[in-house]
C-alpha cells in the first residue's frame, strides 16, 4: 500500500488533500456554511484523483477559499450576552457556571480514575504475559528485541512506570545490563503513547473532532517512533546514552532522596483502591524467572500483613546441601542445616470489590477493561459536552488565544519551549504522561488547542515523566539506586535527544505532518484508526519478537527486504512530489500498482462488507456503546443513537447521500438540519448526547 493512500495521483500537500479531496471537509463549519453545502463537493475529487502528483492543474480546481480541516472551529455562542441579562439571569448563569465547573471536575476525576483502572485491567489481562516477555534471554544481545519487548510490555500493562520498574529491578539484580535495558526503555516510551490514542478513539462520533483528536494523540506516537528510528541505531553504534548517564551517575555522590510526590494519586487512590488493588511485584517476579509467581494472582487480597523472619532447622539429604559447612550438623541419623524463613502472617484483607470473589485474573481484568472503557468513554463524552457548552464565543476566543498564540516577535520561537516546560510541569504534577496527554486529547478534538501547540506540550509531557522517574530513582534503596538512576537518566536523555531531533527546526517537525496525515485518513476511513493501533502497537512488535526468537538470520532475512521496500517507496514518493521529471513516465504516479496497493477504497469496501451486519443494529445500542459501534462499522449516522437504524435507513434513501464521502454531513441529524428539518441548535447536542 502506498504510504499516503490515494494521495499519489493528486496533490503534493498531504496535509490538505489526503484520499482525494477528503481534506476539503470543514472541521466544524459555521451553520451558515453548512446549510448551503451540496453534494457538488464530490466533483473535484474525481478530477483531482486523475491528475498526476506534479500537476499544477489542481490549483485551477481548488475553490478560491479553501476550508482547511485543521483550522480551529469557531464555537458560536448562541446564548444571551452577560450585559443583556437581568440580576436573576446573572445569578442563574453564575450558578450554572459553578455547576458546570463541578461537573467538569467530577467527570475529569472519574476520567483519570478510569485510566488508572484501565491500566490495572490491562495488567490483569496481560501482566503475566508481559512479565514472561522479560524472561527472554535474547534481550541481552538483540536491541531490536529489547525495543519490541518494551513496547509490548508497556502496551500490555498500560504503564511505562511498571515496565521501567521491572527493568530497574532486573538491572539491580544483574539479570540485565544497562546496555540491554536502554532499548527496552525506548520501547516503553512508545508503548505509553497508546493510552491517549485509545482515548482519541472515543471521539470517533464526530468526523472533524476525531480528525483533530486522533492526530493530536498520534503526534506522540510518531515522535516516539521517529526518535527510536534514529536514536536506536545511534545508541547501538555509539552507546552515547549509556556513556553519558554512566558519567553522570559516577560523578555525583547521590544520597537516597525522598519519594516522588504523589499529587494526583492522593486524590484518585481512595476511589481506585475501592475498585481493585494489584500486587505489582508479581509481574516483576515473573520477569525475574520466579516460578512460584506464575501461579500467584495479581489481585491483592491481604493489605495488612506481618512478616516475621526466623531461622529454622531443616533436614537435608547430605552435608553438600547445607547452607554452609558451619551451619551443618547431624542428630546422629539425619543431616540438618539452618535456613532463614520468612513467615507472612495475614492480618487484614483489602477493601475492594474483587477481594472475596476469587475470580481468575483474566476474568477480573476483562470485567474492569469493559467497565473502565465505558466510564472512560462516558466521561470523555461528558467532558467534551461540558467544554463545548462552556467554551463558546468570548470564553473560547480568550482561551484559544492564550493557548495558541505565540509570543511577540522576536520571541515567538520561545513559545514552544514554554509549552514544553508547561507539559513537563503538568506531567510532574499529575505523575503520569498518559493522564496528561489523555486529558489533552479531547481539548485538541474540540478545537481548543491546535496540534502545533499540543506537540510541544506532549514533548514536555515526555520529559515530565522522566523527571518523575529520576525522583523515584533517587528514593530507591542503596543497591537499586545506581541502576534505577542510570535508567531514568537514559530515559531523560533519550527524550531530550528526540526533542532536539524533531522540534527546534520547524522543518523537522515531521511528527505533526505525519499525525495530520493519519488524522485525515482516519477521519475518512475510521476503521483505519483501529487498524493503525493494532498494526503499530501489536502486530509489528509481535512480528519482530517472533522473528527475533527465530534467530537473527531470520530477522535480517525478513527485515532487510522490508526496510528496503519502505525506503524505496519513500524515495519514490519524494521524487514524485519534488522532481517527478527524473522518473520514467510509469513511475511518476502510483497508477502502475493495483488499486488495493495504492488506495484504501477497496479495503474500505471489504471492511464495510465485514461490518455490514453491525451497521443495521449499530444505532440501537445504548448511547455509550454506540461510539464503539461507530468505530467498527464506520457508520456516519451512528451518533444519533436515540432512533433505530430502520428510520435512519429510510431517511438516507430519501436523500441519496453517499455514506462514505467525508464531504457529506457527519450525521443524519446535521444533514436534516441542512435541509431545514431539524432546528439548528439541537444538532450538536443530538450528536454528542450520552
Amino acid at each position: 500500500m502506498a504510504p499516503w493512500p490515494e494521495l499519489g495521483d493528486a496533490q503534493p500537500n498531504p496535509d490538505k488533500y489526503l484520499e482525494g479531496a477528503a481534506g476539503q471537509q470543514p472541521t466544524a463549519p459555521d451553520k451558515s456554511k453548512e446549510t448551503n453545502k451540496t453534494d457538488n463537493t464530490e466533483a473535484p475529487v474525481t478530477k483531482i484523483e486523475l491528475l498526476p502528483s506534479y500537476s499544477t492543474a489542481t490549483l485551477i480546481d481548488e475553490p478560491t477559499e479553501v476550508d482547511d480541516p485543521w483550522n480551529l472551529p469557531t464555537l458560536q455562542d448562541s446564548g444571551i450576552k452577560w450585559s443583556e441579562r437581568d440580576t436573576k439571569g446573572k445569578i442563574l448563569c453564575f450558578f450554572q457556571g459553578i455547576g458546570r465547573l463541578i461537573l467538569l471536575l467530577g467527570f475529569l476525576y472519574f476520567f483519570v480514575c478510569s485510566l488508572d483502572i484501565l491500566s490495572s485491567a490491562f495488567q490483569l489481562v496481560g501482566g503475566k504475559m508481559a512479565g514472561q516477555f522479560f524472561s527472554n534471554s535474547s534481550i541481552m544481545s538483540n536491541p531490536l528485541l529489547g525495543l519490541v519487548i518494551g513496547v509490548l510490555v508497556t502496551v500490555l500493562v498500560q504503564s511505562s512506570s511498571t515496565s521501567t520498574s521491572i527493568v530497574v529491578s532486573m538491572v539491580s539484580s544483574s539479570l540485565l545490563t544497562v546496555r540491554a535495558a536502554i532499548p527496552i526503555i525506548m520501547g516503553a516510551n512508545i508503548g505509553t503513547s497508546i493510552t491517549n490514542t485509545i482515548v482519541a478513539l472515543m471521539q470517533v462520533g464526530d468526523r472533524s473532532e476525531f480528525r483533530r483528536a486522533f492526530a493530536g494523540a498520534t503526534v506522540h506516537d510518531f515522535f516516539n517512533w521517529l526518535s527510536v528510528l534514529v536514536l536506536l541505531p545511534v545508541e547501538v553504534a555509539t552507546h552515547y546514552l549509556e556513556i553519558i548517564t554512566q558519567l553522570i551517575v559516577e560523578s555525583f555522590h547521590f544520597k537516597n532522596g525522598e519519594d516522588a510526590p504523589d499529587l494526583l494519586k492522593v486524590i484518585t487512590k481512595p476511589f481506585t483502591k475501592l475498585i481493585v488493588q494489584l500486587d505489582k511485584k508479581v509481574i516483576s517476579q515473573i520477569a525475574m524467572n520466579d516460578e512460584k509467581a506464575k501461579n500467584k494472582s495479581l489481585v491483592k487480597i491481604w493489605c495488612k500483613t506481618f512478616t516475621n523472619k526466623t531461622q529454622i532447622n531443616v533436614t537435608v539429604p547430605s552435608t553438600a546441601n547445607c547452607t554452609s559447612p558451619s551451619l551443618c550438623w547431624t542428630d546422629g541419623i539425619q543431616n540438618w542445616t539452618m535456613k532463614n524463613v520468612t513467615y507472612k502472617e495475614n492480618i487484614a484483607k483489602c477493601q475492594h470489590i474483587f477481594v472475596n470473589f476469587h475470580l481468575p485474573d483474566l476474568a477480573v481484568g476483562t470485567i474492569l477493561l469493559i467497565l473502565s472503557l465505558l466510564v472512560l468513554c462516558g466521561c470523555l463524552i461528558m467532558i467534551v459536552k461540558i467544554l463545548g457548552s462552556v467554551l463558546k464565543g468570548q470564553v473560547a476566543t480568550v482561551i484559544k488565544k492564550t493557548i495558541n498564540t505565540d509570543f511577540p516577535f522576536p520571541f515567538a520561537w520561545l513559545t514552544g519551549y514554554l509549552a514544553i516546560l508547561v507539559g513537563a510541569g503538568m506531567t510532574f504534577i499529575v505523575q503520569s504522561s498518559s493522564v496528561f496527554t489523555s486529558a489533552l486529547t479531547p481539548l485538541i478534538g474540540i478545537g481548543v488547542i491546535t496540534i502545533e501547540r499540543a506537540y510541544p506540550l506532549t514533548l514536555g509531557s515526555n520529559i515530565g515523566t522522566t523527571t518523575t522517574a529520576i525522583l523515584a530513582a533517587l528514593a530507591s534503596p542503596g543497591n537499586a539506586l545506581r541502576s534505577s538512576l542510570q535508567i531514568a537518566l537514559c530515559h531523560f536523555f533519550f527524550n531530550i535527544s528526540g526533542i532536539l531531533l524533531w522540534y527546534p527546526i520547524p522543518f523537522t517537525r515531521l511528527p505533526i505532518r505525519m499525525a495530520k496525515g493519519l488524522g485525515n485518513i482516519s477521519a475518512k476511513y475510521r476503521w483505519f484508526a483501529v487498524f493503525y493501533l493494532i498494526i503499530f502497537f501489536f502486530l509489528i512488535p509481535l512480528t519482530v519478537f517472533g522473528l527475533s526468537l527465530a534467530g537473527w538470520r531470520v530477522l535480517v532475512g525478513v527485515g532487510v527486504p522490508v526496510v528496503f521496500i519502505i525506503i524505496l517507496v519513500l524515495c519514490l514518493r519524494l521524487l514524485q512530489s519534488r522532481c517527478p521529471r527524473v522518473l520514467p513516465k510509469k513511475l511518476q504516479n502510483w497508477n502502475f500498482l493495483p488499486l488495493w496497493m495504492r488506495s484504501l477504497k477497496p479495503w474500505d469496501a471489504v471492511v464495510s462488507k465485514f461490518t455490514g451486519c453491525f451497521q443495521m443494529r449499530c444505532c440501537c445500542c445504548c448511547r455509550v456503546c454506540c461510539r464503539a459501534c461507530c468505530l467498527l462499522c464506520d457508520c456516519p449516522k451512528c451518533c444519533r443513537c436515540s432512533k433505530c437504524c430502520e428510520d435512519l435507513e429510510e431517511a438516507q434513501e430519501g436523500q441519496d447521500v453517499p455514506v462514505k464521502a467525508p464531504e457529506t454531513f457527519d450525521n443524519i441529524t446535521i444533514s436534516r438540519e441542512a435541509q431545514g428539518e431539524v432546528p439548528a441548535s439541537d444538532s450538536k447536542t443530538e450528536c454528542t448526547a450520552l
Epitope: 532447622n313 552435608t319 559447612p325 558451619s326 550438623w329 542428630d331 546422629g332 541419623i333
Partner: antibody
Framework: QVQLVQSGAEVKKPGASVKVSCKTS????????MHWVRQAPGQGLEWIGA????????AYNQKFKGRVTMTADTSTSTVYMELSSLRSEDTAVYYC????????????WGQGTLVTVSS | DIQLTQSPSFLSASVGDRVTITCKAS??????VAWYQQKPGKSPKLLIY???TRHSGVPDRFSGSGSGTEFTFTISSLQPEDFATYFC?????????FGQGTKLEIK
C-alpha cells in the same frame, strides 16, 4: 519426668551376642532419636549409633557396622541394641541416651549396662 | 572422622577457682559442640549444647564459647560438686565423636 531404664549387667563369651534394652518414659517415644554410647573402663565415650523410633531409621558408627543392630518397639517404648561377634575389647558400660530434637546433643542418659566379655 | 582433643587431660583446682577447659576439633564443626559432666560410676550429664547454650537446670557458673575448631568450657567459680570428668562432643557430622575427657580434681 524423662526416664531411661536399662537392662541389667551381662557376661558374655567371645563370639557371642548381647542384646541390651532401654525402656523409656515421660516423653513421646517416637519424637526423639535414641543413641547408644559405650565407655570402656577408665576410657572415654564412644558413639555406637542411633535409631529414630518414629520410623525405625538407624545410623551406625562405621567401626561397628555389620555387628550392631538397633530396634525399637513402640508398643512398649523400648529400644534395643544388639552387638554380635563379641570380643574382649567390647567390655564396657553401654549407655542409651535420648537425643535432643534436631541435633546430636544427648540430654537424658540411662543408668548404663555393664557388658563383660571374657572366656 | 572428626577428632576432638581436650586439654588439659587432668586439672587440679580449688573451690572458688575459675577453670577453663579447651577442646580442639580436627575440622570446622561450626557450633555443633556439647559439653558433658560425668561423675565416677554415674551416667554423663548434659551441661552445654550448641557450644554456648546451657541445658535446663544447669547453674550459670558453667559456660561455653567458641566456634569452628576451638571451643572453651568455663566454670567461673568451682563448687565442691563440680569435681568430675568433663567431655566435649561434636555433632557436626557422623560419626559423633567425644573428646578423651578432662579430669578435674581437688587441689
Amino acid at each position: 519426668q524423662v526416664q531411661l531404664v536399662q537392662s541389667g549387667a551381662e557376661v558374655k563369651k567371645p563370639g557371642a551376642s548381647v542384646k541390651v534394652s532401654c525402656k523409656t518414659s515421660g516423653y513421646t517415644f517416637t519424637t526423639n532419636n535414641m543413641h547408644w554410647v559405650r565407655q570402656a573402663p577408665g576410657q572415654g565415650l564412644e558413639w555406637i549409633g542411633a535409631i529414630y523410633p518414629g520410623s525405625g531409621a538407624t545410623a551406625y558408627n562405621q567401626k561397628f557396622k555389620g555387628r550392631v543392630t538397633m530396634t525399637a518397639d513402640t508398643s512398649t517404648s523400648t529400644v534395643y541394641m544388639e552387638l554380635s561377634s563379641l570380643r574382649s575389647e567390647d567390655t564396657a558400660v553401654y549407655y542409651c541416651a535420648r537425643g535432643m530434637y534436631g541435633h546430636g546433643a544427648m540430654d537424658y542418659w540411662g543408668q548404663g549396662t555393664l557388658v563383660t566379655v571374657s572366656s | 572422622d572428626i577428632q576432638l582433643t581436650q586439654s588439659p587431660s587432668f586439672l587440679s583446682a580449688s573451690v572458688g577457682d575459675r577453670v577453663t577447659i579447651t577442646c580442639k576439633a580436627s575440622q570446622d564443626v561450626g557450633t555443633a559442640v556439647a559439653w558433658y559432666q560425668q561423675k565416677p560410676g554415674k551416667s554423663p550429664k548434659l551441661l552445654i549444647y550448641w557450644a554456648t547454650t546451657r541445658h535446663s537446670g544447669v547453674p550459670d557458673r558453667f559456660s561455653g564459647s567458641g566456634s569452628g575448631t576451638e571451643f572453651t568450657f568455663t566454670i567461673s567459680s568451682l563448687q565442691p560438686e563440680d569435681f568430675a570428668t568433663y567431655f566435649c562432643q561434636q555433632y557436626s557430622s557422623n560419626p559423633l565423636t567425644f573428646g578423651q575427657g578432662t579430669k578435674l580434681e581437688i587441689k
